[in-house]
Structures are given as C-alpha cells and as structure tokens.
C-alpha cells in the first residue's frame, strides 16, 4: 500500500507530511511559486497541481518537484478552486475573479468554460467523476453550495443556507460532503444532496482548509496556526498534526484511495476527440474547446469559422455570437506588450497584430503556436526605425498593408515577412488607420495631416488617389469596410461619433453620436457594426438595418485597442478572385479592374516592365 501524505499550500511553499511515519513537514522543491492557493493531485501520474494567485497560473510538477510546468497561463484572475478529474484526465477550476468554472485536459489543452452565468465568486471545487457530478461553493451575496454535471449541465443549489464555505471535500466511501464555514467557524457535513446536515465541530476558532481520509477529517486552523484531525463522524479524538503553520491555503491527502472508481472517460477518453466529460449517472458526453462545436457524430469538434476578435493592451480575445451566449476567451498568445491593431487571415487561420511597445507586426495561430515576426522594429542596414500603426490584410494577394507613424508611409509586406515596398508617401502625409478592399482594388486610409485630417481612397498601388472627406473630421481614428454592403465606416475620437458612406464617399451619414467617449476600433459583423470604446471599457454594436438599434455587447473590459470580425471564407468565391491564383501572375501588386480583369503594378521605387507582370 503506498504511503499517504498530507499536502498543503502556504504562499510560496507546497509541503508534505507523511501520515504514517509522522514525519515533519518537508517542502516539495518547486521554484517560482509565489502564492499557491488550491491544490490537487493525479495519483497515477504522481503529479501535483496547484493554482498561483499572484502569477495567475495553474501549474503542475511531479511529487519530487521535477518537470514543473504551467498548464494554464491565460485568462485567470483569482483561481481559488481547482480539482483533478482523475478518470477523464481533466482539470477543473473555479475563478472568483472571472466568475467562471472551466475545464481543460490535464496539460491545459482544449479549455472550455462550463459554468459562467449567475456565478458569484465560485470558490471551493470538488469532483465526483464516477458519478459525473461536480460540487462548488459560492462566496458572493448569497453564499451557497451548488452541484452540476461535470459538463456544466443540470445545475442545482444543494445548500442555500450556509456561510462562505471552503475546503469542500467528498468522502467517496460514505457518500458525504464536508466543508468549513468561514462565517460560523463550523465544520459541517451533509449527504450528497445537501441533506442530512450535521455539525462535526463547532468550537474551532478559524477552520479554513479541509480534507478527508479514511476515518478522519483533516483541517487547517488560521487562528491556532495548525493542521488538526478528528473523527469524521463524531468530531472527537482530535489531534494536532502540525503546529506553527500560518495561513495554510489548501490541504489534501495524497493517496490512491482518494482517486478510485471508473467511468467511460477512463477508457480511451470515451473515444472523444477533445474532452470527455462525465455526466450522471456513469455516463459521459464529448466536449469541445471553447467556441468549437460538437459535430453530428457527437465525438469530434469543429473550429469556429465566424467570430469576433478584440484586443486589449496585453491580450487578444475571441468572442462568438451563439444561442448559449458563450463567454469570450483569451487566446493563449505569449509576450503581448501593447497590442495596437489586429487582423486575421481566414485562409491560413492566422492572427496578425501590431505591438506598439515592440514596434513590430507579428502573427500566430489561435492556439499561440507558430509565432512569427512579420515586420521587425528596425532595419539596421537602412538605419530605419519603424512604428507600425495599423494593418489590413489583402487575403487574395497574401499581403499586409500597414501604416507607419515613424515614416508616414503605407507599406506592403508579404504574409511571410518579405517586403513588397512602399505604395504611398507624401511630404505632408500622415496615414494612420487603413482598410483594404481587394475585391475592388482599393485601399482606404485616414490621413491625419496637421489641422486638415482627411479620409482618402487610393488604388492598392497608391495611384488613383482621391480625398473622400476633409470636412466634418477632427481625429478619424478607425475605419471599417463592408464590401457586401458597399459601405465605409469611421469613428472620430475627437468628435465622438461614428459615420458611414458609400465606398465612393457618397451618402455620408452619422450613425451614432450619443454616449461615445473614446471609440478606438470598428468592425462589421453580419448586419451589425461593432465598436469599442476605450474610456467606457465597452464593446457595443448598432444594427445597420435600423431594426434593432444599439446594443451593449460587453462592459468592463480594460485597455481595449481594436476589434475585428472574422467571417467564414467561401473557398469557391475566394478562388474566383483573379489575384487569388499566384497573385494574378504579378511579381508585386495585383489589382482588380472595374471589368473584373487584373492589372499588375509596382511599389513606388519600382516600375512595371514590358511583360506587364514584373517590376524592376
């Protein structure tokens, strides 16, 4: 029989005490732990898992401290509850800051939000994977203990009349729940339905963490600075296991008897492609990562093809518009310092962004992999410093058009990072926001010339340049375009209004000019125009058909910087574009003419050669 250990977390420490040899506590040799909170383990792997409130991570390591890795590093606020599903090999956690209960595989893959509506500071979390239930406590306005199936369905309140409950623990053998109540300083127990409630201890100064093993409950007391144990039914036969321990956050017993049983997920992941989630009684459902949808086979998942991306200073988020109002998620992209602008290539499913702290354009897959710097911050050979401001992708030619604050030009760069050249440059020009319309061969940009801001249009090679608007503008900061509707949209951050026109500049109208404080990004998504307001920390939308008006999409999102809609790419339509096949045969810029044919063109420093395809 393997040895049983008490494991406990105490700020930068995770320590163990043998329950058999009564060893003194021994620190597990972990580096970089700052504020360990919730703890759990996977006995078959001999690994421990913990949340770190300060680092905002969930990590794991072997019991000897080796192979330490962060398994969840994004989108955590205060992950104060966490539990291992040892049968499905899933990780569950509750976050009192985001008010979400989430799940992923033990390595952090395939993350999904299970419960997010009407959650008020979810705290302690316990799993019963053999039965398919999860249990948690809430510390909000009305503290309670809730239960749901392990896929988040069938939610119910078990114990409504309770204080802020912590240390929620299941006695799997005797089918009882145990918890500490921080408001009454009681240790209580109930059956698995929250009934047959009993007080196990009522004379403790400050019980906090709690666990159960065999005939005993073990708890931490913040007042007595101790770990103690007592008989789990009578509360008698109390023993101090260890004293002089301040503020122990979580406690558990590491032993195989705490992780027994079987369910369908324990066998080949239930033949699910991503998550296998236990449900009552003894059943399972296949689950998908956030925003993915379960296919008709009920086993495999498909990635979203239509969604919204929005950026904050150091995060890029994805949002889907669906019936269940799925919550937005942070994409796991590292080293974002100051995201200024975002775009997306639906063909290669890659995200592009400008980081204005690092002064570069980067790209990555949505899962954070294949990170690559497309445009670097300086070109030493040319003694050139750049400051990318905005970008727009021509998906057909596979080019990025981007403006630069330092050089005040419009550049074109291939998606693989190779330079095409400068297409627009003028002594007085200050091009800033940009959006391309490759379907028609044009680009639109704001020109923030001193005292005379303009919105202009030019062909994608910088020719045919014309000013669309020069009056009624102060600081046009963002542009959006809908080729299907034939509309251009812009936001003016000084005038605090959003306007639109036809793509030729005709039919200019003010769409919205009330209660807009600092619009910084616009995008068109189906029949809606979405915008972000940095000052109000809000995403809003307006129905362009005029039927539904203005709607608040999401509030309290700090440091918003950009928003971009992604719609499903129709490959048939895509291939019909004359520039989609090998850039229309052009060496540099491929333009669609009014009759649907193409012409090749060149950046400013080159001229078109006699073959009318190449530049030299």
């Amino acid at each position: 029989v393997p040895e049983a250990f008490l494991l406990f977390s105490r700020r930068a420490d995770i320590r163990r005490i043998s329950l058999e040899t009564n060893n003194n506590n021994v620190a597990i040799p972990l580096t970089g732990v700052k504020e360990a909170s919730a703890l759990d383990f996977d006995v078959t792997d001999n690994r421990i898992y913990w949340t770190d409130i300060s680092l905002k991570t969930i990590s794991r390591a072997f019991m000897n401290g080796s192979a330490l890795e962060h398994v969840v590093e994004f989108g955590l606020d205060y992950p104060e509850g966490m539990a291992v599903d040892w049968l499905g090999k899933n990780l569950y956690w509750a976050d009192t800051g985001t008010n979400r209960i989430e799940v992923s595989k033990l390595d952090g893959q395939h993350r999904q939000v299970l419960v997010w509506k009407d959650l008020d500071s979810p705290r302690a979390l316990a799993l019963d994977p053999a039965e398919g239930f999860m249990y948690w406590t809430e510390w909000g306005g009305k503290p309670k203990i809730d239960r749901a199936a392990m896929d988040g369905s069938e939610r119910t309140t078990l114990v409504p009349n309770v204080g802020r409950a912590n240390g929620l623990t299941i006695d799997y053998a005797k089918r009882r729940l145990y918890w500490t109540d921080l408001d009454t300083n009681l240790i209580e127990s109930s059956n698995m339905l929250g009934l047959n409630r009993e007080v196990i201890a009522d004379d403790l100064p400050h019980p906090f963490g709690l666990t159960q093993y065999q005939d005993y409950i073990y708890w931490t007391d913040w007042s007595r600075r101790s770990i103690e144990r007592a008989n789990k039914t009578s509360g008698q036969n109390r023993t101090i296991i260890q004293g002089h321990l301040d503020y122990v956050m979580d406690i558990l017993v590491f032993h195989s008897s705490r992780q027994s049983g079987w369910n369908e997920c324990a066998s080949s992941n239930g033949h699910c492609s991503h998550l296998c989630l236990a449900v009552p009684v003894g059943g399972f459902v296949c689950g998908c990562p956030a925003h993915y949808s379960l296919n008709a086979d009920n086993r495999t998942c498909s990635a979203p093809t239509t969604f919204l991306l929005f950026s904050q200073k150091s995060a890029i988020n994805r949002m889907v518009i669906d019936e269940q109002q799925s919550p937005d998620i942070i994409l796991p992209i590292h080293s974002l310092r100051n995201v200024r602008a975002i775009d997306y290539d639906p063909l290669d499913k890659q995200l592009y962004w400008i980081d204005s702290r690092q002064n570069m354009i980067r790209k990555a897959q949505e899962d954070g992999s294949q990170g690559f710097t497309v445009v670097v911050s300086s070109v030493p050979s040319q003694n050139l410093e750049i400051q990318p401001y905005d970008l727009s992708i021509d998906i057909y030619s596979r080019y990025i058009y981007w403006t630069c604050e330092a050089t005040n030009v419009i550049n074109v760069t291939r998606l693989d990072g190779r330079s095409v050249g400068v297409v627009l440059k003028g002594e007085q020009d200050r091009p800033r926001a940009i959006v391309v319309n490759p379907e028609k061969g044009y680009m639109y940009f704001t020109n923030l010339q001193e005292r005379s801001p303009k919105i202009e249009r030019a062909a994608l090679d910088g020719t045919e340049r014309e000013v669309l608007f020069f009056s009624g503008l102060s600081k046009p900061i963002a542009l959006a375009l809908d080729s299907r509707l034939g509309k251009l949209f812009w936001a003016d951050s000084d005038l605090r209004r959003i306007e639109s026109s036809d793509l030729s500049g005709a039919n200019r109208i003010v769409l919205e000019d009330s209660n807009i404080l600092q619009p910084v990004g616009l995008t068109v998504f189906e029949n809606w125009l979405y915008w972000i307001d940095k000052q109000q920390q809000m995403i809003e939308k307006i129905d362009m058909t005029g039927r539904e008006g203005r709607t608040k999409v999401q509030a309290r999102i700090a440091q918003l910087s950009d928003i971009h809609a992604v719609k499903e790419l129709n490959l048939q339509e895509y291939r019909q574009h004359p520039c989609a096949q090998d850039n229309g045969g052009c060496s540099h810029i491929c333009l669609v003419k009014g009759d649907g044919t193409t012409r090749c063109s060149c950046p400013m420093h080159l001229v078109l050669l006699q073959d009318e395809l190449s530049c030299g």
């Epitope: 700020r11 930068a12 700052k34 409130i53 300060s54 301040d246 503020y247 956050m249």
Partner: antibody, heavy 121, light 107 residues
Framework: EVQLVESGGGLVQPGGSLRLSCAAS????????IHWVRQAPGKGLEWVAS????????DYADSVKGRFTISADTSKNTAYLQMNSLRAEDTAVYYC??????????????WGQGTLVTVSS | DIQMTQSPSSLSASVGDRVTITCRAS??????VAWYQQKPGKAPKLLIY???FLYSGVPSRFSGSGSGTDFTLTISSLQPEDFATYYC?????????FGQGTKVEIK
Amino acid sequence: EVQLVESGGGLVQPGGSLRLSCAASGFTFTNYDIHWVRQAPGKGLEWVASIYPAGGDTDYADSVKGRFTISADTSKNTAYLQMNSLRAEDTAVYYCARSPGWALRGAMDYWGQGTLVTVSS
Amino acid sequence: DIQMTQSPSSLSASVGDRVTITCRASQDVSTAVAWYQQKPGKAPKLLIYSASFLYSGVPSRFSGSGSGTDFTLTISSLQPEDFATYYCQQSYTTPPTFGQGTKVEIK
C-alpha cells in the same frame, strides 16, 4: 508569539540619513510581505515601502522613491529601511507591518510598536 | 493611485449605539479592502480583511461589507473600548492606500 520590533529612529537634520530596522520573530519571515507604514504627527497612515523577502520584490511610494531603500536579511529575520535625503515632511512614526499576501487579500495582520523619526534642523 | 475616501471624518456616539463608517474607492478594488482600529500612541490593529471577513480574535460586533468601490464598517453595539480611529485600506493595486481615518468619540 509573533513580534515585530522597530528600531533606529531618532532626530536627524534635513538631507541626512537614517536606517530603520524591523526584527521579526515567531513566524516564517520569508512567507510574508514586510511593509513600512508611517504616520505623521496627528495625521493618517501612509504606506511607504514593502518587500517580499523570499523573492526580493520591492515596491515604494512615489514620495520616497529614489531616496528610501527597503531590504531584508533572511538569515537575521530582519527588514531594513534606509532613508536618505530626509526632509521635514518625512517626520513620522514609522511602523513595520507584515502581510501574508493573498490569504488576507493584502491586509496587514501584525504591526510593530513604531519608531519615531524626526527631521529637523 | 487609488484614493480611499472615508466618511465621516469624525463622529460622536454613545455606548450601545450602532455605528457605520463608509469608505469609497476611486476605482474598483474588488474586495481587497481591510479595516483597522488605532488608539492613541498605539499601532493599528486589523479588524476586517477582504472587505467582510472578521479577523481572528476580533469581537463579532464588528462587521464589514461591500465590494467594488463602496465599503462599510459597522459596529453593531459600541463598547467603551471601541472609541478609537478607524482606517480603511485597499490592497488591490500597488501602492496600498489608506483612507484618512474616522475618529469615533464619546458623545
């Protein structure tokens, strides 16, 4: 028994220096943030600086940044506040306090008795 | 920096009275607020942490509530030893900041 004992206060001229000590006992020193908080005569509490001895992380109030330095000697379970370029407005009782971090959401659960620093010519 | 504004700055009350002191943060501080009691010539003592949790050994007549920007310290039945100055403090962001204090005096 948890104890925090400050020492090193006294009278010093403007522009002068002083080093305060905070000797900690009765708890695991490296598991706590150690703060210096001051209170000018008849006034409220003002946070000055903090250190997390385990990691060496430090923070300072803008009013003392560049003049004061907080440090800790984990072998002696002692935190220090080196105060240079002292000004009349630095006159206060200086308290040393500890915080267990997230456990109490940053609250300071034990305070020393304080040491008086008077900056005057 | 986050400002913590306490009110009132002073109040007079009698033994047995219910006393309420409020603290308003200049921006959202979640529940990262503590309350301290200080008597003349003494160091502050922690009463409430995380907005509403009673610190060990503190009498249950003290309670705290609130979240976001508005917080309250309540003494349900004022006792002679409760006459002191009370401070709120936020620890949501660095630097931690204190309210200016509320002096509770005998009427």
